[in-house]
């Protein structure tokens, strides 16, 4: 069977919008489909429909077509805003430019070049002719509009209501006349929808035929509407991904505009006596690098040839000899007058001191008002009206509304770790922006942590599994297995997710990764009846510096004699010193006939200040670390051990109060073990279960 | 400084044993994921072994079965030992830096030490 | 296991030429790649990582794109110190790998 064309890039979308008909004559037909897509392969072909189409909406919600033979600059009709609605107008329509000969030109031009009235189509009068509506469907021979049915040289034309004047051609732009843009198009919003060799351009949020990452949703800012010519990357003009499946991209032929200036938005903040950012917006004179050196012309190519000219960098204002930054560098710089140095940056420009730039937070960043919109793997942030009930499932009071502007990183909830943001991608649905605390900020997330303020046990007796307690098992212990051998251990916190160190994942192929549960043998001998095998579908790595991971199971894990979760601290608690704890793992044991069995070694803890003095105060221990020292002297976790679990118990209530992480060392005599503090992490933990999707047992 | 510096090159007979040491100055070994890379003479980079931060290693195919990669935290030394030596396994032997804990990018490199393979 | 292919094996090009190589990985690698730039009788150099970012010290004309399995190197206007031999690297995996870099592109002088 062929393969149907897929017509939607020919239609311009409207999101949340649908078409009102005032005139109650206009018709229209409705019919219940899957997708938007089938929607426009119907109307293009104007299969079983009674009128031309020029237009749609696709109701997600009935998940159903509304074709119309209107559109949104038809006379008896008005947009609405609706938000299950999408509306599609077929382009030809509503375009009043033409691309190559215009034989899909469908506008309403009626008057040809020198002026005179088209005749119409389907009249004899003056001129008879045979291009009737009938012997051309398809094309579009309505009123008296200028067409070109059969793709001839000179555009489209009509037949003229002079009856001297038997047809001519009517003064129609071409497309790439009519669209224009300034500087490199990074701010271009035209509608150029095909490239410069007359390729059609693939919708942004198709990824058929080539997939990418530029997705509408993912950058807001970037223009990504339907199909047209955008330059989102700081390539040299626009661009788009082609529907030949053979032609992943090519530029569009944009001219630049007469006058070419920018537009508000576009221009980064000038500044004329100090650097903002970058520097990109700087227009000063300073006109020598950091060491005196004079600076080389921008127009000249001696004593270094280059291409930063002014004409190829319109917009950056290189004049004279004055530092400048046209290439997103560090700061401005220049060209030397020195042969033997080609660049040096204007370092001595000094720094503006504005707030608005801020890229620091304080305490917990609750009061950050930066305007970075970007989280730590780069994904670009969502608005945050989008997603005020996901917040509102989370925080128990109303968030200060002011604040949450755009979808600038932002701290509503109060969550210990800093700013953060929604990302729009259901696989991450929030994540930490890369905004450090500002230097010399030493405000707490945390207080007095030597002191038992806050209980870590929760008010609840041991768990209890089919009757038998659950105080001498070990369910909880995870193995995680890198290529079908044991590399490090974990913690089961609930059915779907384990507690682990970010160290323990080399490969990011997640394939290459295995959990067992509910064994004791390293090698699951003799576990057979109670072992569970489970593929990783995701890691959540914990906030900046923590070390953590949280591991997401493909599927829940089952609970049983054999396999138990463990209970996690209360946020911010601290456990009394000299309190009893263990350490499990399957890691070294220093003996040569290992026996693969999980180990087990007492441990009990030990204040910050005292656990430093035992590493002979090398060791500065803050708010997010915790230690215990072996009642055995040498005893202690090691290699294999990393990722498994400081349990402690308190009420009865066992707990998982740190994670093993590397880089303090195998059991060293009297130098107690430095943890990862659990209680400091539990509300990042619980904001990770209660947000993220998890597969149904 | 932070830098590395190889040594233990040289000539050896095909069939026979070489230890590589990588000695580090300026970081510590045990903090990053450390790599060899070996270059044969007028080909490209080869990428060898890497041991991990939790201690777990890596090999490239070409590797597996006779080369160990091993680190001496106290003397802040990382080695390659090669053990059945073959002719295509002549080649600059640099030992690298990983950027991370893990696999990544290589962001210090030696300057390389030359072993040739032949009888 | 992932493979890495760079294109071309080598590029005549002039001073000033805006050059691009391209690596492309077997598997998708999302944005885990670095660029290298080697000169003969010297360790390499990092240029790019993450595909996009440039490493410290590295001039601004030096550029790195793509995601998935499609990766670019441009330089956009050739110096005399850019001619080199340039290497892809996955950052992405090593399990079950015969090489972890591409097999590298000459840049010489037209």
């Known amino acids: 069977q062929r393969k149907r064309r897929n017509t939607i890039h020919e239609f311009k979308k409207s999101a949340k919008t649908t078409l009102i008909k005032i005139d109650p004559a206009l018709k229209i037909k409705t019919k219940k489909v899957n997708t938007a897509d089938q929607c426009a392969n119907r109307c293009t072909r104007n299969k079983g429909l009674p009128f031309t189409c020029k237009a749609f909406v696709f109701d997600k919600a009935r998940k159903q077509c509304l074709w119309f033979p209107f559109n949104s600059m038809s006379s008896g009709v008005k947009k609405e805003f609706g938000h299950e609605f999408d509306l599609y107008e077929n382009k030809d329509y509503i375009r009043n430019c033409i691309i190559g000969k215009g034989r899909s030109y469908k506008g309403t031009v009626s008057i040809t070049k020198s002026g005179i009235k088209c005749q119409p189509w389907s009249s004899m009068i003056p001129h008879e002719h045979s291009f009737l509506p009938s012997s051309y469907r398809g094309k579009d021979l309505q009123e008296n509009y200028c067409r070109n049915p059969r793709g001839e040289e000179g555009g489209p034309w009509c037949f003229t209501s002079n009856p001297e004047v038997r047809y001519e051609v009517c003064d129609i732009p071409q497309c790439s006349e009519v669209e224009c843009m300034t500087c490199n198009g990074e701010s271009y919003r035209g509608l150029m929808d095909h490239t410069e060799s007359g390729k059609i351009c693939q919708r942004w949020d198709h990824q058929t035929p080539h997939r990418h990452k530029f997705l509408p949703e993912r950058y807001p800012d970037k223009g990504f509407d339907d199909n047209y010519c955008r330059n989102p990357d700081g390539q040299p003009r626009p661009w788009c991904y082609t529907l030949d499946p053979h032609t992943r991209w090519e530029y569009c032929a944009i001219k630049t505009c007469a006058d070419n200036t920018m537009n508000d938005t576009d221009v980064p903040l000038e500044t004329t006596e100090c650097i903002q950012g970058q520097g990109e917006g700087y227009r000063g004179t300073v006109n020598t690098i950091w060491n005196g050196i004079p600076c080389q012309r921008w127009d000249s190519q001696y004593p270094h040839e280059h291409d930063m000219t002014p004409e190829n960098f319109k917009c950056k204002d290189l004049r004279e000899n004055y530092c400048r930054n046209p290439d997103g560098s560090e700061s401005p710089w220049c060209f030397t007058t020195d042969p033997n140095i080609r660049v040096g940056y204007c370092s001595q420009i000094p720094n503006c001191d504005m707030s608005h730039g801020q890229d620091c937070y304080r305490g917990n960043g609750k009061n950050y008002m930066g305007n970075l919109s970007q989280t730590r793997s780069g994904l670009t942030c969502s608005m945050w009206d989008k997603n005020m009930e996901d917040l509102h499932r989370h925080i128990f009071w109303e968030p200060d509304a002011s604040k949450l502007n755009e979808n600038y990183c932002r701290n509503p909830d109060d969550d210990a770790h800093g700013p953060w943001c929604y990302t729009g991608n259901p696989l991450i649905p929030w994540d930490y922006c890369p905004i450090s605390r500002c230097e010399g900020d030493t405000t707490p997330t945390i207080v007095n942590l030597d002191h038992p303020v806050i209980s870590c046990a929760k008010t609840k007796q041991l768990r209890v599994v089919n009757g038998i307690p659950t105080r001498t098992n070990i369910g909880w212990m995870v193995s995680l297995r890198y290529r079908n051998k044991h590399i490090c251990g974990g913690s089961l916190i609930k059915e779907s997710w384990v507690l682990t160190a970010r160290q323990c994942f080399p490969s990011r192929d997640l394939k290459d990764y295995e959990a067992w549960l509910g064994i004791h043998d390293v090698h699951g001998r003799g576990d057979e009846k109670c072992k569970q095998v489970l593929n990783v579908s995701q890691l959540v790595y914990g906030p900046e510096g923590s070390d953590l991971v949280l591991m997401k199971l493909a599927r829940p894990a089952v609970l049983d004699d054999f396999v138990s979760t463990i209970d996690l601290p209360n946020y911010g608690c601290t456990i009394p010193e000299k309190t009893s704890c263990s350490v499990y793992g399957w890691g070294y044991t220093g003996l040569i006939n290992y026996d693969g069995l999980l180990r087990v070694a007492h441990l009990y803890i030990m204040g910050n200040e005292k656990c430093s003095q035992h590493h002979r105060g090398k060791v500065t221990l803050n708010e997010s670390e915790i230690c215990a020292g072996a009642e055995k002297i040498g005893s202690g976790p090691c290699e294999g051990d990393y990722g498994g679990p400081l349990v402690c118990e308190q009420h009865k209530m066992r707990m998982v109060l740190g994670v093993i992480v590397p880089g303090r060392g195998c059991a060293i005599p009297n130098r107690p073990g430095i943890f990862v503090r659990v209680a400091y992490y539990a509300k990042w933990i619980h904001k990770i279960i209660l947000t993220y999707k998890v597969p149904q047992s | 400084e932070v830098q590395l510096v190889e040594s233990g090159g040289g000539l050896v007979q095909p069939g026979g044993s070489l230890r590589l040491s990588c000695a580090a100055s300026?970081?510590?070994?045990?903090?990053?994921?450390m790599s060899w890379v070996r270059q044969a003479p007028g080909k490209g980079l080869e990428w060898v072994a890497v041991?991990?931060?939790?201690?777990?290693?890596d090999y490239a195919s070409s590797a597996k079965g006779r080369f160990t990669i091993s680190r001496d935290n106290s003397k802040n030394t990382l080695y390659l030992q090669m053990n059945s030596l073959r002719a295509e396994d002549t080649a600059v032997y640099y030992c690298?830096?990983?950027?991370?804990?893990?696999?990544?990018?290589?962001?210090?490199w030696g300057q390389g030490t030359l072993v040739t393979v032949s009888s | 296991d992932i493979q890495m292919t760079q294109s071309p094996s080598t590029l005549s090009a002039s001073v000033g030429d805006r050059v691009t190589i391209t690596c492309q990985a077997s598997?998708?690698?999302?944005?885990?790649l670095a660029w290298y730039q080697q000169k003969p009788g010297k360790a390499p150099k990092l240029l790019i990582y993450?595909?996009?970012k440039l490493a410290s010290g590295v001039p601004s004309r030096f550029s790195g794109s793509g995601s998935g399995t499609e990766f670019t190197l441009t330089i956009s206007s050739l110096q005399p110190d850019d001619f080199a031999t340039y290497y892809c690297?996955?950052?992405?995996?090593?399990?079950?790998?015969?090489?972890?870099f591409g097999g590298g592109t000459k840049v010489e002088i037209k």
């Open positions: 690298a830096r990983v950027y991370d804990s893990v696999w990544n990018h290589f962001n210090l």
């Open positions: 041991i991990y931060v939790i201690g777990a290693t």
């Open positions: 690297q996955q950052a992405y995996s090593v399990s079950n790998v015969d090489n972890a």
């Open positions: 300026g970081f510590t070994v045990s903090a990053y994921a």
């Open positions: 598997q998708s690698i999302s944005s885990w």
């Open positions: 993450q595909a996009s």
